[in-house]
Amino acid sequence: RQQWELQGDRRCQSQLERANLRPCEQHLMQKIQRDEDSYGRDPYSPSQDPYSPSPYDRRGAGSSQHQERCCNELNEFENNQRCMCEALQQIMENQSDRLQGRQQEQQFKRELRNLPQQCGLRAPQRCDLEVESGGRDRY
């Protein structure tokens, strides 16, 4: 039993290393930025400068493409709930430095929680997304 679990853990690690979670990060960032835009922001906010290049394409077409690619990646973790949790935590950890303020962080977390469901996958049980940047050790 323990041996199987160790093998399972190694398999999860290699799955995570192979996975490209970037489309998930891009999809989620676009989603929360669109939400912010639709609620309206300070027109003089520097992030509203139309000439500043954004790492995230805000147009809807790009987002649906990112979502499709994201779901394809997450699908690899469908049969391993713990590995799915690790993938989501990795997304959270990767983006935590880029999130501005508590509100954006909460919004990102909310969207991240819904991500498996959006992809038609089961959300992981016992999965704590309250991670800090650089806060977790790997097993």
Partner: antibody, heavy 123, light 110 residues
């Protein structure tokens, strides 16, 4: 008011069997995970087993797997622990607990506990 | 030997603040939610904190929980003699597919 009442404890010889029961009331039993937790005299808490709302998933402490069986009867709002091949180290107070674990992004936590029933394994 | 490590005992004077640590690994605290329990002498344990930081109704805000990496902490402010008890942390361990409890910490209010 949530109530959990254990019964079935007692003195049993090594190798013997016992069946613990827990009668639940004051909440919708069928919507909660349930858990058995034990505490040996003068020692700390030790989780024994979990059972999902519909009984479809069960988890056990390694040292009791294959000897203990957790089950539930939602129609009777009752939780059970069948204990076979009992050993001296199984001597403990056994608590029936309600587990607040939900379907996603939540943890196991035990928000209601019974008074406990003492199981003594001795020759 | 518990996989979750707690100090065996802590003590402080009434009115003071005390913290109880619970140290684990990536497969338990690092990935899963932590809960805390108080066990007064001769009674069943009582839930104090769940999902790392949440308090059930009826638990005073003198009790707080936090988590960072693979460690969790229970904080108690405004210590009262009635707080003398054993305190346990708990979490799920993904490697073992089991709930783990810490070894317990005896709090003495001097």
């Amino acid at each position: 008011e949530v109530q959990l009442v254990e019964s079935g404890g007692g003195l049993v010889q090594p190798g013997g069997s016992l069946r613990l029961s827990c009668a639940a009331s004051g909440f919708k039993f069928s919507t909660f995970y349930m858990t058995w937790i034990r505490q040996a005299p003068g020692k700390g808490l030790e989780w024994v087993a979990n059972i999902k709302q519909d009984g479809s998933e069960k988890d056990y402490l390694d040292s009791v797997r294959g000897r203990f069986t957790i089950s539930r009867d939602n129609a009777k709002s009752s939780l059970y622990l069948q204990m076979n091949s009992l050993r001296a180290e199984d001597t403990a107070v056994y608590y029936c607990t309600r587990n607040g674990l939900q379907d996603s992004y939540s943890g196991d936590f035990f928000d209601h506990w019974g008074q406990g029933t003492l199981v003594t394994v001795s020759s | 030997q518990s996989v979750l490590t707690q100090p065996p005992s802590v003590s402080a004077a009434p009115g003071q603040k005390v913290t109880i640590s619970c140290s684990g690994t990536g497969s338990n605290i690092g990935h899963n939610y932590v809960s805390w329990y108080q066990q007064l002498p001769g009674t069943a344990p009582k839930l104090l904190i769940y999902d790392n930081t949440k308090r059930p109704s009826g638990i005073p805000d003198r009790f707080s929980g936090s988590k960072s990496g693979t460690s969790a902490t229970l904080g108690i402010t405004g210590l009262q003699t009635g707080d003398e008890a054993d305190y346990y942390c708990a979490t799920w361990d993904a490697d073992l597919s089991a709930v783990l409890f810490g070894g317990g910490t005896k709090l003495t209010v001097l």
